[in-house]
Interface confidence: low
């Protein structure tokens, strides 16, 4: 069928709760493309009817909720004017009774389920909740060893649990819980997180360093394609997220409809003392509205921006 196959990492998921996966693979999904989801090489696409338990929501596949029998390989087919890519995602569903067993015993869990706090520092845990815009998430509650977390040292801030003056006793099994509302129905999302404690502060107290950009402007012609890398160095055990934002919104969300400006796939190089991360931003076509706007690269608490500006007129051309 002429589609190029791309194999994504396995996702290990908990049954009886909502789950969503977004079919994005920049720069493939940056242009005018159609996205269709299939299960286990079926010729019949996943339903787009929002009342269906499993359905496609724009570029997402949404499970409301996920069930044990949903394990399998899902494909999303991205068709552009001159291209076709088939992305394979292996979803493994397990019956998880969070209070009974340790999530640490599970194989190959992603880093979202394993987080690190730094001893004696003010640090944070992140509740990773990835859902389409049709899903409304309520306030997040945090639990440790099945008890709701309370106390002066803990503060809930959006999707993060801020922990001040981390102690050795803060290691253990955490969970973040949120109520998700979709089409008038409510579902509980509960993510288990295994937390370990490290004494390693890393460079400069584990504050990521943005090497590029450096809060500067870039001259670029109207209508051109532009790719800018954000290069970040951070300690190997960091839990910082790296992303591009504009107007304090993720670029992928801000340009969700046009997909004209997209964030790339993060890569990293491992060094003895740290990792060097690269995540790019792609402007498929620079428009007038992009000039003068700060495009921010975020890495943990660090930020740096680029501002696009029109090149100065070249009077030698006259």
């Amino acid at each position: 069928d002429g589609c190029k196959d791309i194999f994504m990492k396995n996702e290990i998921l908990s049954a009886s709760q909502p789950f969503a996966f977004n079919c994005t693979f920049p720069p493939i999904t940056s242009g005018e493309v159609s996205v269709t989801w299939y299960k286990n090489s079926s010729k019949i696409p996943v339903s787009k009817i929002i009342q269906s338990r499993i359905h496609q929501d724009e570029t997402w596949i949404l499970f409301l909720p996920m069930e044990w029998g949903d394990s399998g390989v899902y494909q999303c087919v991205i068709k552009g004017r001159d291209s076709c890519h088939r992305i394979h995602v292996n979803l493994t569903v397990f019956e998880k009774h969070w209070c009974d067993t340790s999530i640490g015993g599970l194989p190959n869990l992603s880093d979202e389920y394993k987080q690190i706090l730094h001893l004696g520092k003010d640090d944070s845990l992140t509740c990773h909740l990835h859902f389409p815009k049709s899903c409304v998430l309520g306030p997040i509650k945090w639990y440790k060893d099945c008890n709701e977390i309370k106390g002066e040292r803990f503060t809930v801030l959006e999707t993060r649990l801020l922990v001040s003056n981390v102690s050795a006793e803060d290691r253990g099994n955490y969970a973040c819980q949120a109520i998700l509302t979709h089409s008038g129905k409510q579902y509980e999302v509960l993510n288990g997180i295994t937390v370990s404690i490290t004494e390693r502060a890393g460079y400069g107290g584990s504050v990521p360093k943005i090497i590029y950009p450096k809060n500067h402007s870039i001259e670029v012609q109207l209508g051109t394609t532009l790719i800018v890398d954000c290069n970040v160095t951070d300690t190997k055990d960091n839990t910082n997220l790296r992303c591009w934002r504009v107007n304090n919104t993720l670029v992928d969300d801000y340009y969700d409809e046009s997909k004209r400006i997209r964030e790339g796939v993060e890569t990293h190089v491992s060094f003895r003392e740290h990792n060097l991360y690269t995540v790019n931003i792609t402007f498929l076509e620079v428009k007038m509205e992009d000039y003068g706007l700060p495009f921010m690269c975020h890495a943990g608490v660090s930020t740096a921006y680029i501002i696009l500006q029109l090149p100065a007129p070249d009077f030698r051309a006259y």
Epitope: G202, G205, I211, N231, F271, R272, H274
Partner: antibody, heavy 127, light 107 residues
Framework: EVQLVESGGGLVKPGGSLRLSCAAS????????MHWVRQAPGKGLEWVAL??????????YYSAPVKGRFTISRDDSKSTLYLQMNSLKTEDTAVYYC??????????????????WGQGTLVTVSS | DIVMTQSPSSVSASVGDRVTITCRAS??????LSWYQQKPGKAPKLFIY???NLHTGVPSRFSGSGSGTDFTLTISSLQPEDFATYYC?????????FGQGTKLEIK
């Protein structure tokens, strides 16, 4: 001029203890990672321990043969590196070198190597 | 632990000869390899870092190359003061590990 001067070596019985010191001068000691490397008579070089700088949280690493017996420490105010050696064994007999790590961290510019070495101090563990 | 294997363990050569010493890592160490020269009764001296960078004051007849698992130290034209033992060191990960050394002797 960078100088590293070790002291504290000598003859000790198996099971005994010894504390090595290394006085650093000619550079800003606070900024650098510091190592101990040893060399048994007629043998090759063996890395022993590392202590990172303050900016990196004074993190410590040891080689397997000395872990639990040796303790590396530093006093930045005195520009001095230490190695406390307990439960010494005959196989710990060696010249112990105090070494500066040239690790320079500024974005892309990272170099890992041991750029300056002291003259060494001999530790003999024998009954 | 990463094992560093140097070869040969000893080499006899004459003044003016070109000599190559190799160092092989048991797994990928990128370019995090340095070379040291040690003379009897003296402390080692850094000669090459990051696989190919000459340390300050090291003569240009010394050169280093390689990345990943295979590295070489080359002396283009041996001088009398070059007769010594040479060690490689990986600093990609802890514990840091040295090669067993290559003794360069006068033929």
């Amino acid at each position: 001029e960078v100088q590293l001067v070790e002291s504290g070596g000598g003859l000790v019985k198996p099971g005994g203890s010894l504390r090595l010191s290394c006085a650093a001068s000619g550079f800003d000691f606070t900024d650098y990672y510091m190592h101990w490397v040893r060399q048994a008579p007629g043998k090759g070089l063996e890395w022993v321990a590392l202590i990172r700088n303050k900016a990196a949280g004074y993190t410590i690493y040891y080689s397997a043969p000395v872990k639990g017996r040796f303790t590396i420490s530093r006093d930045d105010s005195k520009s001095t590196l230490y190695l406390q050696m307990n439960s010494l064994k005959t196989e710990d007999t060696a010249v112990y070198y105090c070494v500066r790590d040239m690790t320079i961290y500024d974005g892309y510019y990272v170099d890992y190597a041991l750029d300056y070495w002291g003259q060494g101090t001999l530790v003999t563990v024998s009954s | 632990d990463i094992v560093m294997t140097q070869s040969p363990s000893s080499v006899s050569a004459s003044v003016g000869d070109r000599v190559t010493i190799t160092c092989r890592a048991s797994r990928n160490i990128n370019i995090w390899l340095s070379w040291y020269q040690q003379k009897p009764g003296k402390a080692p001296k850094l000669f090459i870092y990051k696989a190919s960078n000459l340390h300050t004051g090291v003569p240009s007849r010394f050169s280093g190359s390689g990345s990943g698992t295979d590295f070489t130290l080359t002396i283009s034209s041996l001088q009398p003061e070059d007769f010594a033992t040479y060690y490689c060191l990986q600093s990609q990960s802890y514990p840091l590990t040295f090669g067993q050394g290559t003794k360069l002797e006068i033929k």
